[in-house]
Amino acid sequence: RRDVAHGILNEAYRKVLDQLSAGKHLQSLVARGVGGSLGGGAGDDAEPLSKRHSDGIFTDSYSRYRKQMAVKKYLAAVLGKRYKQRVKNKGRR
């Protein structure tokens, strides 16, 4: 039983560590400016990284990720004629 308990604790501890390291990795990605310099969308936050809260870091990183995905789809459609990857959200605006 003690082994089982240890196993459960170890598993829980590993998950916490994974989450922490994922958060640190995300912060490092943002700090390094991963996602490129291509601008997009309204309201891009130009504040220095040091002033942002952790929520802001995650939001900014997600915003960069979204831009990158949008550009990938664009390139696939216009330079690769991959029409299946088009953005077709007619009801959005």
């Epitope: 990938k72 664009y74 953005v87």
Partner: antibody, heavy 107, light 109 residues
């Protein structure tokens, strides 16, 4: 695909170019703006997607704004400088282009 | 950001001959999404080749594209007078969208 709105403007005077499309569902295509200074090469400005989100080259961010309606795509040059003198092209994806509209920025 | 360098410029050849235009990117072109455009004076660019080697509909098979990664080539065989134009390569760049090469003028003798 047809561009309009190009004219002579003084530096700092905002200018909006319009790309009018017919027979094209803007909800199914990307629309791209590209410019070409006199005697120079092509320069990619940015694009707008089906959902109305616009993306720009880093040098163009803040200098241009792309927006659209159901039949038109606009390119606003927020504060033109002499370096913005060029022919501005609008393209559906990159396979159907307009003839371009000339913008001259001079004091 | 990728920088696309085209060589040579200008390039000239006789009618019926072959010309080769090179396009080198400073970094790998995303997905090999590289296109070639033809532009004549006073006209908009015309798409010839997309995804490095695929021929756009309606473009003569005399035009062909090849290459991958950072090195791409446009070949025009059986050169015609009508082929006199400036040719641009354009590559996919995730950080900058589309990067155009500086252009190569083709002169037909």
């Amino acid at each position: 695909v047809e561009e309009s709105g190009g004219r002579l403007v003084t530096p700092g005077t905002p200018l909006t170019l319009t790309c009018t499309v017919s027979g094209i569902d803007l909800n199914s295509y990307y629309m791209t703006w590209v410019r070409q200074a006199p005697g120079k090469g092509l320069e990619w400005i940015g694009f707008i997607d089906a959902g109305g989100d616009a993306y720009y080259a880093s040098w163009a961010k803040g200098r241009f704004t792309i927006s659209k309606t159901s039949t038109t795509v606009d390119l606003k040059i927020t504060s033109p400088t002499t370096e913005d003198t060029a022919t501005y092209f609008c393209a559906r994806d990159l396979d159907l282009w307009g003839q371009g509209t000339l913008v001259t920025v001079s004091s | 950001a990728a920088v696309l360098t085209q060589t040579p410029s200008p390039v000239s050849a006789a009618v019926g001959g072959t010309v080769t235009i090179n396009c080198q990117s400073s970094e790998s072109v995303y997905g090999n999404y590289l296109a070639w455009f033809q532009q004549k004076p006073g006209q908009p660019p015309k798409l010839l080749i997309y995804e490095a080697s695929k021929l756009e509909s309606g473009v003569p098979s005399r035009f062909s594209g090849s290459g991958s990664g950072t090195q791409f080539t446009l070949t025009i065989s059986d050169l015609q007078c009508d082929d006199a134009a400036t040719y641009y390569c354009a590559g996919g760049d995730i950080s900058e969208g589309v990067a155009f090469g500086g252009g190569t003028e083709v002169v037909v003798k």
